[in-house]
Amino acid sequence: YDFTNCDFEKIKAAYLSTISKDLITYMSGTKSTEFNNTVSCSNRPHCLTEIQSLTFNPTAGCASLAKEMFAMKTKAALAIWCPGYSETQINATQAMKKRRKRKVTTNKCLEQVSQLQGLWRRFNRPLLKQQ
């Protein structure tokens, strides 16, 4: 999906008011300095591409993020504020239902959500001019 035509300000507002709170809850008890960011993004569409990938694509050691509250709210925000996003996700959602596993917060998941935190932080910044 190409995130270029999303309403970034509306997604930013959704992140600040709700998604961030669920990330805070998920990461509670974890020091902000515990994990270093290894995933970055260069502009808002790129940030959303990376956010979608980390949030909804199962990875080795962390298969369950898509069912977390922050993930569901992320999905809702993208569906509302990114034209045509919902249609692209129907097949992916059906595939995910078949893979559904028990929710377990592993260290790998905490690390992945820490990466998400960094991506959202970068998405959140208004455009910075390169010197």
Partner: antibody, heavy 119, light 107 residues
């Protein structure tokens, strides 16, 4: 833990330039934007601008464009603000402050650097 | 630029009281508001971020509320160590802007 250590007080002549530093420790320097804030008794707190250490990207308040230049040195995890063509109006306490973990706020503050501009 | 207005420059309260410090934005800043405390001779300290989240180590007598244009910092059961300046900051859009401080005095 996160610490922002700022350089010591400066006394400089009008018309000169000065470069204040802020050494970050306890976190990955390139992961967080750094902001600079000016505080005076008359104007209170004023946001000067911000820098993304990873890209060198910056943003400034209009008032400080041409007055302040923000830079960052990744190798030493240090952020800088250079102030030029100094006048008595630039006398203030300058703070560096780090972007918050979730964005949309700043969390940790340096101890501040007092700049006095006087002939 | 977005203007943040703290209409109360001074507030006088007694130990054990509850006090509300308010901040009004000139346009919608959603929940991108933080509250800071500054004691004499010290650098500011973060109390509340994203309008209602308490920063690490901040006592639970400090609470933040609001969204859009109207924000409130509530200090319940005021303690003598709460004598300080309090200010809000909007971080929705550059340039980020501070409210004028509210000086809390303890009777």
């Amino acid at each position: 833990q996160v610490q922002l250590q700022q350089s010591g007080a400066e006394l400089v002549r009008p018309g000169a330039s000065v470069k204040l530093s802020c050494k970050a420790s306890g976190y990955m320097f390139t992961d967080y934007a750094m902001h600079w804030v000016k505080q005076t008794p008359v104007h209170g707190l004023e946001w000067i601008g911000t820098i993304d250490p990873e890209t060198g990207g910056t943003a400034y308040t209009q008032k400080f464009k041409g007055k302040a230049t923000l830079t960052a040195d990744i190798s030493s995890s240090t952020a800088y603000v250079e102030l030029r063509s100094l006048t008595s109006e630039d006398s203030a306490v300058y703070y560096c402050t780090r972007e918050g973990s979730y964005g949309g706020y700043v969390d940790y503050w340096g101890q501040g650097t007092t700049l006095s501009v006087s002939s | 630029d977005i203007v943040m207005t703290q209409s109360q420059k001074f507030m006088s309260t007694s130990v054990g009281d509850r006090v509300n410090i308010t901040c009004k934005a000139s346009q919608n800043v959603h929940t991108a508001v933080a509250w800071y405390q500054q004691k004499p001779g010290q650098s500011p300290k973060t109390l509340i971020f994203l309008a209602s989240n308490r920063h690490t180590g901040v006592p639970d007598r400090f609470t933040g509320s609001g969204s859009g244009t109207d924000f409130t910092l509530t200090i319940s059961n005021v303690q003598s160590e709460d004598l300080a300046d309090y200010f809000c900051l909007q971080l929705w859009n550059y340039p980020y802007t501070f409210g004028g401080e509210t000086k809390l005095e303890i009777k």
